[in-house]
Amino acid sequence: GQNITARIGEPLVLSCKGAPKKPPQQLEWKLNTGRTEAWKVLSPQGGPWDSVARILPNGSLLLPATGIVDEGTFRCRATNRRGKEVKSNYRVRVYQIPGKPEIVDPASELTASVPNKVGTCVSEGSYPAGTLSWHLDGKLLIPDGKETLVKEETRRHPETGLFTLRSELTVIPTQGGTHPTFSCSFSLGLPRRRPLNTAPIQLRVREPGPPEGIQLLVEPEGGIVAPGGTVTLTCAISAQPPPQVHWIKDGAPLPLAPSPVLLLPEVGHEDEGTYSCVATHPSHGPQESPPVSIRVTETGDEGPAEGSVGESGLGTLA
């Protein structure tokens, strides 16, 4: 048999080998496609199937506008002028080239040594689904699950049957100061069909800068709270990407999951003490905040706030 690829929506003519070019003809076309459950023999006189597959006067079969449901096998059996039976067999596949792929939500820059989302490559309207590939400086990027991560999603339109592909690229650049170029290409995987490429994006890779400073904010302000009240400690860091934050009370690490916020609900005297946060940045090690003091006092029995001047006129520091 012969393999035929036809573009969706385009006409396709299959010739019936051995058939006389003009009537009288002895021929039979039958098909097994997405429109049939078994073999369907087409009437030479024509009929309701003519809108999808019609026998032409020369014995060829015309598919006026091929669709996904027309994929399948087409066979013709003809008797030639010498009385010999000749068979033709076609395996028809259809395809649709999507629109040019695009990189949506591209990064503005990348940071070395940490995971960075480069962008999402989107291709809409393909059949069959095809594949998306990423390229770095013109070379194919092979996802390794560590330095190069690709998250893929394929969706099929319920009415048209065409596919939308999405591919999200995440990379960990090894060093700063470089300017890598990323692009994405779509391939249908059909012979003689060149891949479709996105416009490339060039990104600057910078070294992860040290945190510009670490601040510990306390609510209520001053760190004085009545028993049963709530204290919120927030570790504010300007570093990118956000580092892991651990907490220290009176010099000892608190056995808590890393979080930039520490909540102390329904405080008692056991919660009193000196608190600080430690930010751990992948490339710069730990950095500790200045400490704050938390005091639990009865309402109306509030002592002076940290660093304030008491009635004695002496500066007091908790």
């Epitope: 429109r35 078994a38 009437s43 006189q45 009929g47 309701p48 199937w49 999808v52």
Partner: antibody, heavy 119, light 107 residues
Framework: EVLLVESGGGLVQPGGSLRLSCAAS????????MTWVRQAPGKGLEWVAS????????YYPDSVKDRFTISRDNAKNSLYLQMNSLRAEDTAVYYC????????????WGQGTLVTVSS | DIQMTQSPSSLSASVGDRVTITCRAS??????VNWFQQKPGKAPRRLID???NLADGVPSRFSGSRSGTDFTLTISSLQPEDFATYYC?????????FGGGTKVEIK
């Protein structure tokens, strides 16, 4: 809204002729096959003629072949049925329907026009 | 030519009843069968497309099924507005053939 409106029915003598029209609106007329179906008084439905979307190919049952001609004018969104050599058994309500090929069947129908063949 | 043998030709039923109408094709017609409802003095209205697909705007109490060359229209719970005549149609081969019709009457 898809709308099919038949006209042209009436009383005609046996052997006479009549031309039915069907005005279509609310859809892209030249994308669809069109069909005429008839129903004799108190009887069931009978297929009369179909035409493909371009108008190049027409189809008839033996009962009306060589007497009836289906045609269309895509510029006017109109379907026609020319009926010649009419017989008493052609008396029926004639309906215009959208479709007639395997992609559609008959999805919309007009309200019908009555043709009476009697002397 | 293909024959579409529809049964029963008439039936009496009450509101709320489950009603089943059958058409048998004399040869394979694939899925290419429509079901129509017709009320006196009105044009037919398509209920089911391609054997099993509910047409737009048709209540879900109507359903179509197929087993080989046997096609069935089912009304799960008959409503007062469902008393009418029902027809099947094969549109796989010319001449296109309708079933003889089933008149559903009030018991």
């Amino acid at each position: 809204e898809v709308l099919l409106v038949e006209s042209g029915g009436g009383l005609v003598q046996p052997g006479g002729s009549l031309r039915l029209s069907c005005a279509a609106s609310g859809f892209t007329f030249n994308n669809y096959w069109m069909t005429w179906v008839r129903q004799a008084p108190g009887k069931g439905l009978e297929w009369v003629a179909s035409i493909d979307n371009s108008g190049d190919n027409t189809y008839y049952p033996d009962s009306v072949k060589d007497r009836f001609t289906i045609s269309r004018d895509n510029a006017k969104n109109s379907l026609y049925l020319q009926m010649n050599s009419l017989r008493a058994e052609d008396t029926a309500v004639y309906y215009c329907a959208r479709g007639g090929d395997i992609t559609t069947g008959f999805d919309y129908w007009g309200q019908g026009t009555l043709v009476t063949v009697s002397s | 030519d293909i024959q579409m043998t529809q049964s029963p030709s008439s039936l009496s039923a009450s509101v709320g009843d489950r009603v089943t109408i059958t058409c048998r094709a004399s040869q394979d017609v694939g899925i290419y069968v429509n079901w129509f409802q017709q009320k006196p003095g009105k044009a037919p209205r398509r209920l089911i497309d391609r054997a099993t697909n509910l047409a737009d705007g048709v209540p879900s109490r109507f359903s179509g099924s197929r087993s080989g060359t046997d096609f069935t229209l089912t009304i799960s719970s008959l409503q007062p507005e469902d008393f009418a005549t029902y027809y099947c149609l094969e549109f796989d081969e010319h001449p296109l053939t309708f079933g003889g019709g089933t008149k559903v009457e009030i018991k």
